[in-house]
Amino acid sequence: SGTTNTVAAYNLTWKSTNFKTILEWEPKPVNQVYTVQISTKSGDWKSKCFYTTDTECDLTDEIVKDVKQTYLARVFSVPWRNSTHGKETLFGTHGEEPPYENSPEFTPYLETNLGQPTIQSFEQVGTKVNVTVEDERTLVRRNNTFLSLRDVFGKDLIYTLYYWKSSSSGKKTAKTNTNEFLIDVDKGENYCFSVQAVIPSRTVNRKSTDSPVECMGQEKGEFRE
């Protein structure tokens, strides 16, 4: 049989950040290779990563077609000797289907992790500081242009700002559903800033890690009277 001595994949796991999406699995192949298929709940299977010896497959190109769809992937274990005859031999020399394992379902819009945000700039004018969060580009496209995280999530995405005087430990917080904060500060004081992204409507993967801390007096800032 064409499926002898193949080991079914296991521990299929989606790894996704800002819609960059990779399916990972085990085990490392011995005398076999893998082919991955992906589909929406109602769609046809599409094959990716043909006859690979990797234990991961980048499925970003497929899931960004509609990030609100729910996707299912499956990983086929194909005997090494069958993988050298071209794509038509996926189902073995006698036409039987090789063993495969299904992934968990994955809905990118609800499940992709939020990447660590970056403070793009801050500008002080008198006792006000405008803090701007970089609007990271994703691999999601519309009309042939890549969308930013804000384009994709709209007001579903909130940024929380933590800020504090360099000279004290007491923190304050503010939030925005744009990418800009305008906060009051004490004149003559230096402040430090960190931001976190949040998707309020989610129940899991709701928050990003905190951005790197940026402090006034460093190069990202600008001061005007």
Partner: antibody, heavy 117, light 107 residues
Framework: QVQLVESGGGVVQPGRSLRLSCKAS????????MHWVRQAPGKGLEWIGL????????IYDPKFQGRFTISADNSKNTLFLQMDSLRPEDTAVYYC??????????WGQGTPVTVSS | DIQMTQSPSSLSASVGDRVTITCKAS??????LNWYQQKPGKAPKLLIY???SLADGVPSRFSGSGSGTDYTFTISSLQPEDIATYYC?????????FGQGTKLEIT
């Protein structure tokens, strides 16, 4: 289902300390911001502070900074409010609440604290 | 810090009346304003979030409006079960602040 249950309230003498707990079930506290709010008898609601249990960030109303400390034990899915140097005016019902970033969507039933000699 | 001035502090109305409560912020709070209902001995219950959005399961007679510094909460037709104290909360920046509350009674 989501539930928050406060405990640890009671009668305490002025100058003493008290630690309140808020046990969460039906969700992981590290996925949310968590708050403490209090209400003195016959008075309005007063925000004490918040914690992001995932990274330990805490924010307080300045009037409570230094005397009250919010912490969390993610392994026990529990929020804490450590209150030191208690005063009679700290007599109130203390609530914990979950914050989804647009609103506080779940509140505990409250635990009463009386500061009296 | 942002101050929230809520008015009136109490009001009396009849069943079926239209009831309006206002909250004025000391600075722009960018619609980060919620309205809560609290009945004696109970925790507050969310009615309106982001100034105008009705919370799940809340009757449509409750509504909110406003932006910038001025916000309004309306009950279009007062029902007996609406007897409670109502609070606004700004959460745009810390310290978060509640209005003083409006105690609603039925005449």
């Amino acid at each position: 289902q989501v539930q928050l249950v406060e405990s640890g309230g009671g009668v305490v003498q002025p100058g003493r300390s008290l630690r309140l707990s808020c046990k969460a079930s039906g969700f992981n506290i590290k996925d949310y911001y968590m708050h403490w709010v209090r209400q003195a008898p016959g008075k309005g609601l007063e925000w004490i502070g918040l914690i992001d249990p995932e990274n330990g960030n805490t924010i307080y109303d300045p009037k409570f900074q230094g005397r009250f400390t919010i912490s969390a034990d993610n392994s026990k899915n529990t929020l804490f409010l450590q209150m030191d140097s208690l005063r009679p005016e700290d007599t109130a019902v203390y609530y914990c609440a979950r914050d989804n970033s647009y609103y506080f969507d779940y509140w505990g039933q409250g635990t009463p604290v009386t500061v009296s000699s | 810090d942002i101050q929230m001035t809520q008015s009136p502090s109490s009001l009396s109305a009849s069943v079926g009346d239209r009831v309006t409560i206002t909250c004025k912020a000391s600075q722009d709070i960018r619609k980060y304003l919620n309205w809560y209902q609290q009945k004696p001995g109970k925790a507050p219950k969310l009615l309106i979030y982001y100034a105008t959005s009705l919370a799940d399961g809340v009757p449509s007679r409750f509504s909110g409006s406003g932006s910038g510094t001025d916000y309004t909460f309306t009950i279009s037709s007062l029902q007996p079960e609406d007897i409670a104290t109502y609070y606004c909360l700004q959460h745009g920046e810390s310290p978060y602040t509640f209005g003083q509350g409006t105690k609603l009674e039925i005449t």
